[in-house]
């Protein structure tokens, strides 16, 4: 029959070439002379001339060694023609299968593979995957089947079997729980890929495994005991820098320290922060310390990390003995602001009050006093006793120096320390009103017509406070009542002045006496301009000129 079974030819054959493979034969050769030919890639089309056929015998020839990795299968057509060139058979399919030889070594896809794994993990944890390829056949043979293995591990600490590799997938995993970044931060594995499923050619590469940091080391104080000296009253004062060591990766959350004052800071006087570069704990005063109240503080500070510990670790504690240094403190007036009620107008030399300061220092220091600010110069202060006396007339109605009945004075106390310190106090004198002002009318100049005059309403003011004010009483004196009348309104806070007899145009003095509820009398002269006019007028008209 005009058929041929698939032909298997091993690659890399050593010849001699041409090498006879198989004979094409048509049974029509009994009747006529047959000529054989082949076509297809590898015969008459690229790659041309790999195969040929003996024209008259039909022997299929291989002209050179084959490479399966280049072409694994050739599909040719065999032809049979008679002498006259007529086709005697249908073209026949010829399959030539190139069988594999193990002529390629495995090749890793990288010279160096890099992976990482957290320290302290248990066996079974995947690290990385390595890959090697082999051009040989891995379907019908083991030539291209790669088996992975670890050839060596550096360093060999804590032992030489820290990792394993899946022989088929190339996945590297941990097989020991002894990974400790602080001892071995990186392992270098020499890995092998061997074809023939582990029995053939071998190639090597490197797998570098970085051991990642876990917070498995607690920060430790070094030293654990500190002594510090701090002046009293200093706020924000750096007391001490606390130093810790931590074996975890520098500048990582597992290394960065977090400090906590665990005890000894009952009054919340201290605070502690972490220095961003040195990782030291900076202990500072949050409030001023008081030597007189407590001259020594023993603080207990605990240190942990920003990151939580991955296991139960003992925390380190430091002890800081803080010695408070005595400072000459300023005297403090008690109270800092003193309110004293005093009558205005008291006689000169009259005592106002005693205003003294206390010295926080334990020594019996002498305190001397003086007035620092006394705007009106009304007061004096005894330097030894702090006695304040009047040396001027205290005037409640003095608008330049008195606001809302209060006269403000600043006093100073100075101790005899070395150097001396001073403290100030504020003395607020609430001046009690005395009926020392009589009522005054406003305005004190009026203009009025001498015919059908309009009544003039004058407001009454009194600088004193109630009850030394309204109701007011009015009385005309010095014969002013001949031409004028003065009446206080119902509310008692205005006086109405009326012209009751004709006066020629001129300026007149009206003598008006006003008295307040406390009978304090004040005589005021009202300047009245009388004009020749009727009713209401503001200024006197000029002389009449006829036309």
């Amino acid at each position: 029959d005009w058929v041929v079974a698939p032909i298997s030819v091993p690659e890399n054959g050593k010849g001699p070439f041409p090498q006879r493979l198989n004979q094409l034969k048509s049974n029509k050769d009994r009747d006529t002379k047959i000529f054989y030919s082949i076509t297809g890639p590898g015969a008459d089309s690229p790659p041309e001339g790999v195969f040929a056929v003996e024209k008259e015998t039909g022997w299929l020839l291989l002209n050179k060694p084959l490479d399966r990795e280049e072409i694994a299968k050739y599909e040719l057509f065999g032809h049979a023609v008679s002498e006259n060139g007529a086709s005697v058979e249908d073209p026949m399919n010829i399959s030539i299968i190139v069988t594999d030889q193990n002529d390629h070594k495995p090749k890793f896809t990288q010279d160096t593979f890099r992976g990482s794994v957290l320290e302290g993990v248990l066996p079974g944890t995947s690290v990385m995957q390595v890959t090697a390829t082999d051009e040989d056949d891995a379907i019908y043979t083991y030539n291209g089947v790669v088996a992975y293995s670890i050839h060596s591990q550096e360093p060999k600490d804590p032992h030489d079997l820290m990792f394993t590799i899946h022989r088929s997938t190339g996945t590297i995993s941990v097989i020991s729980s002894g990974l400790d970044r602080e001892k071995v931060p990186e392992y270098t594995l020499t890995i092998q890929a061997t074809d023939m499923d582990g029995d053939g050619s071998t190639t090597t590469a490197v797998a570098v495994v970085e051991i990642l940091d876990a917070n498995d080391n607690a920060p430790m104080f070094d030293p654990q005991k500190y002594e510090a000296h701090v002046p009293e009253n200093a706020v924000g004062h750096e007391v001490q820098r606390l130093t810790v060591t931590d074996l975890d990766a520098p500048n990582s959350p597992a290394w960065r320290a977090t400090y906590l004052i665990m005890g000894g800071d009952d009054g919340d006087h201290f605070t502690i922060t972490t220095h961003p570069e040195s990782n030291q704990g900076i202990l500072t005063t949050r409030k001023g310390l008081d030597f007189e109240a407590k001259n020594q503080h023993t603080l207990y500070v605990e240190v942990t990390n920003e990151a939580p510990f991955v296991l139960k670790l003992p925390t380190s504690t430091a002890t800081i003995v803080v010695h408070v240094e005595d400072v000459n403190e300023a005297p403090v007036f008690v109270p800092p602001s003193k309110v004293v009620e005093v009558q205005e107008g008291i006689p000169t030399g009259e005592p106002v009050c005693v205003y003294t300061a206390e010295d926080p220092d334990k020594e019996n220091q002498k305190i001397s006093y003086r007035i620092l600010r006394d705007p009106a110069g009304w007061l004096a202060m005894d330097p030894d006793s702090g006695q304040v006396t009047a040396v001027g007339t205290l005037d409640r109605e003095d608008e330049q120096f008195v606001r809302n009945n209060i006269y403000e004075v600043m006093v100073l106390a100075m101790d005899n320390g070395s150097p001396p310190t001073t403290g100030t106090g504020t003395l607020l004198l609430t001046l009690i009103d005395v009926n020392d002002h009589g009522p005054v009318p406003e305005p004190r100049q009026i203009t009025i017509c001498n015919q059908s005059p309009v009544r003039q309403v004058l407001n009454i003011t009194d600088k004193d406070l109630s009850p030394h004010t309204s109701p007011f009483q009015a009385q005309l004196t010095d014969d002013s009542d001949i031409y004028w009348t003065a009446e206080v309104n119902e509310e008692g806070d205005t006086v109405v002045l009326s012209l009751k007899k004709f006066l020629k145009q001129d300026t007149y003095d009206v003598h008006l006496s006003l008295s307040d509820h406390g009978n304090k009398e004040q005589l005021t002269v009202i300047r009245a301009t009388v004009c020749d006019c009727h009713g209401h007028v503001e200024t006197c008209p000029g002389p009449w000129k006829g036309g």
Epitope: G120, P123, G124, P158, T164, H166, S168, S177, V310
Partner: antibody
């Protein structure tokens, strides 16, 4: 001499709790991962849980996950297994074993846990 | 159902040799050379007798040997003795959080 000594077993009602301890001696305890393995009466060995030498990494069998907690105190050379929500099927001898890479050695003598009402 | 398959029982006469198989998959026994064998006498704790397929800890008789082919590991005991009568368990490493797979155990009877 390398020794592991389990304690804390006993009879407990379903839903109850027990805490097993394993005291280690004769080796550097903190350098070893440790494991609990159990054996139900007449049955084979079943791995229960493991913990790394530092205590930072733990594994559990699916059958005990969420109910059992493995821990260790390296300062006391002691391994623990806190067992909560116990079931009848947790009845077994519980062995504590050192994990030398990926094999169990040494083993303790075991402690019996019976879960029954 | 154990992850690794072992015969339930094997037996042999004193002086004979026996083999216990332990069959897994290409992801455990077949993938790694980390098969271990344990011997357990009745009422006693298990004891490691082989690690890494064929490595004997000190103090273990050289009558115990191990091998592996494909996905199956084997424990061989030569010159059987009465004290070898025990349960034998295999374990294999597997790359996951259940990193230890146990076989169901094999009861060895010395006739």
């Amino acid at each position: 001499e390398v020794q592991l000594l389990e304690s804390g077993g006993g009879l407990v009602q379903p839903g109850g709790s027990l805490r097993l301890s394993c005291a280690a001696s004769g080796f550097t305890f903190s350098s070893y991962a440790m494991s609990w393995v159990r054996q139900a009466p007449g049955k084979g060995l079943e791995w229960v849980s493991a913990i790394s030498g530092s205590g930072g990494s733990t594994y559990y069998a699916d059958s005990v996950k969420g109910r059992f907690t493995i821990s260790r105190d390296n300062s006391k050379n002691t391994l623990y297994l806190q067992m909560n929500s116990l079931r009848a099927e947790d009845t077994a001898v519980y062995y504590c074993a050192g994990l030398d890479r990926v094999w169990f050695d040494p083993w303790g003598q075991g402690t019996m846990v019976t879960v029954s009402s | 159902q154990s992850a690794l398959t072992q015969p339930a029982s094997v037996s042999g006469s004193p002086g004979q040799s026996i083999t216990i198989s332990c069959t897994g998959t290409s992801n455990d026994v077949g993938a790694y050379n980390y098969v271990s064998w344990y011997q357990q006498h009745p009422g006693k704790a298990p004891k490691l007798i082989l690690s890494e397929v064929n490595k004997r800890p000190s103090g273990v008789s050289n009558r115990f040997s191990g091998s592996k082919s494909g996905n199956t590991a084997s424990l061989s005991i030569s010159g059987l003795q009465a004290e070898d009568e025990a349960d034998y368990y295999c374990t294999s490493y597997r790359m996951d959080s259940t990193f230890m797979l146990f076989g169901g155990g094999t009861k060895l009877t010395v006739l």
